[in-house]
Amino acid sequence: AWELTILHTNDVHSRLEQTSEDSSKCVNASRCMGGVARLFTKVQQIRRAEPNVLLLDAGDQYQGTIWFTVYKGAEVAHFMNALRYDAMALGNHEFDNGVEGLIEPLLKEAKFPILSANIKAKGPLASQISGLYLPYKVLPVGDEVVGIVGYTSKETPFLSNPGTNLVFEDEITALQPEVDKLKTLNVNKIIALGHSGFEMDKLIAQKVRGVDVVVGGHSNTFLYTGNPPSKEVPAGKYPFIVTSDDGRKVPVVQAYAFGKYLGYLKIEFDERGNVISSHGNPILLNSSIPEDPSIKADINKWRIKLDNYSTQELGKTIVYLDGSSQSCRFRECNMGNLICDAMINNNLRHTDEMFWNHVSMCILNGGGIRSPIDERNNGTITWENLAAVLPFGGTFDLVQLKGSTLKKAFEHSVHRYGQSTGEFLQVGGIHVVYDLSRKPGDRVVKLDVLCTKCRVPSYDPLKMDEVYKVILPNFLANGGDGFQMIKDELLRHDSGDQDINVVSTYISKMKVIYPAVEGRIKFSTGSH
């Protein structure tokens, strides 16, 4: 028998520095977690103690904090190189700055192979990107070799900016021939490493003949055997065992997100490459694990540029940006409109001639808007200003919801109106009318939504049975502020870009902004 230790991360999302327990900015260092300096300590400790170790990343290193905004992926390559990752799969967020924003900072600088079998380049890009990412890699480990095949969510064109010269194929269809090639090469230990979410990970384990282990990402799935060490609730045991169509037991793993845990899986193979046993658990990277001094020093050196950036002007406002709770928790506020417009703008993807865009709607809990921005400071808007408006380090995500769920969400928005509660929704691509004289749960009297399958966008009544795409904060997608119906009834959820980054990019693009209150949210006569 031959034993392999797989160490894995996924959806790190730019958390290079240690974070608080909820993966936001570290405040009390003695209680902080994660970060590459701490990760390195643990990885090195395992490498010294065990003979056959692979360190793998399942994608979405890009996007999530000011680190990515400033360094644009150079930080990912630098610190992943320093940690000596063995391989990485491409995630959807690796395309957030377009293909060039992937090629130059990461693909050309990474010292480890970057993988995806289901992304095929065409046209002029094919020769430019050739060899910079690969469908599979054969990694020598000890006296054996391990095959790694990569995959990436085929929804990436709707979630990011890969351009028109990359084709995202069905994962299973693309993986099988590459696994077959590895088998032909007499590589009999094969890991599928990728970024399509836990449901697809399980399907790959079931359907792709020859895959021995699946290491996934995208869905931020937390798996754990025994008593979990922090706040995350396990979606299943670690590893999650799938019985393949040809009768094999295939371990599937994921390690939550944000570098909070290091996935740790031990696999025992027989001489023919069959999995005999698999066991492990994610390791919580808490403050009991010291940060490596040399990596930490490097982090501090790179940090300097971030502090300078946060005070630079992004753009100007010529109007007061009303982000006060007195406005945003009671009525349409222009800060809410600005943020929603930025959210939609960030999701412009012309992937189908029938649609002017794949999504037109935004909802945003008023309680998530934490500060106004005064225009009487020469109109200047800085990252620092936006960090006061959006201090929670969230993301603006894409969900699919039925019209009936949206109607429930808007009823929830005003079910206890007048108490300055955070659930009052700010909107984009939606016209809503409330009648507060009616009883809670029946106060939405008009709900019109902007069409997407149209050449001239216009507002049509919401259809209860239709499925709509909506951009919203991850806080709402996870049921925050009492929006349990969204969490329970959503049909799809893809995590998006860092909230501040979305708004800052929009302001930089627009240069000068003047959002108005324009009648997106109305109250019927006599009730307000």
Epitope: D86, K111, F112, P113, Y136, K137, V138, P140, V141, L185
Partner: antibody
Framework: QVQLQQSGPELVKPGASVRISCKTS????????IYWVKQRPGQGLEWIGW????????KYNEKFKGKATLTADTSSSTAYMQLSSLTSEDSAVYFC????????????WGQGTLVTVSA | DIVMTQSHRFLSTSVGDRVSITCKAS??????VAWYQQKPGQSPKLLIY???TRHTGVPDRFTGSGSGTDFTLTISNVQSEDLADYFC?????????FGGGTKLEIK
């Protein structure tokens, strides 16, 4: 573009050792295997072994174990092959090469280094 | 070791002709076969890998076929610059082995 530049010809005495270098450019050295191939004058090709500069693991053709030692220096993106206890049978042109996809054919070759073993 | 046999040490052809170079493996290697062209005093050049995939920049008159034990490199519309040695190679099992080569001569 991908390039592999080998060191110049060597004339060595029987029993001695020689080290051939293969300096690479145009790609990330640590991400691809380097293969070594022997060609005797007017003869076919023989695969000697490979090194993976990402972790310095090596694999040898049994026939060349003890004869060839493969190493790599990531700081200079250079691979080396040391040949020891040389005999006239070791007189040959030695090539380094790189693939496009692991193992699947040698796509890029050095220009070759002629080693002549003669008293 | 797997022996790769190229039965013709020499093949003679004319410009514009179609010629097939064959290679037989002593045991099955699926499609783990590459073909190389080598001109005098030069390094080998990869033409085909995975038995039938043409390497970037290789003219489409070069075609590879076969699987298991029998493999063929076909050159249609032979050009004078195709005068060279052609080698097959298997990379299915260690040690990886090459055929003895076939020298293509132009009449």
């Amino acid at each position: 573009q991908v390039q592999l530049q080998q060191s110049g010809p060597e004339l060595v005495k029987p029993g001695a050792s020689v080290r051939i270098s293969c300096k690479t450019s145009g790609y990330t050295f640590t991400r691809y295997y380097i293969y070594w191939v022997k060609q005797r004058p007017g003869q076919g090709l023989e695969w000697i072994g490979w090194i993976y500069p990402g972790n310095f693991n090596t694999k040898y053709n049994e026939k060349f174990k003890g004869k060839a030692t493969l190493t790599a220096d990531t700081s200079s993106s250079t691979a080396y092959m040391q040949l020891s206890s040389l005999t006239s049978e070791d007189s040959a042109v030695y090539f380094c090469a790189r693939d496009v996809y692991d193992y699947a054919g040698f796509a890029y070759w050095g220009q070759g280094t002629l080693v002549t073993v003669s008293a | 070791d797997i022996v790769m046999t190229q039965s013709h040490r020499f093949l003679s052809t004319s410009v514009g002709d179609r010629v097939s170079i064959t290679c037989k493996a002593s045991q099955g290697v699926a499609t783990a076969v590459a073909w190389y062209q080598q001109k005098p005093g030069q390094s080998p050049k990869l033409l085909i890998y995975w038995a039938s995939t043409r390497h970037t920049g290789v003219p489409d008159r070069f075609t590879g076929s076969g699987s298991g034990t029998d493999f063929t490199l076909t050159i249609s519309n032979v050009q004078s610059e195709d005068l060279a040695d052609y080698f097959c190679q298997q990379y299915s099992s260690y040690p990886w082995t090459f055929g003895g080569g076939t020298k293509l001569e132009i009449k």
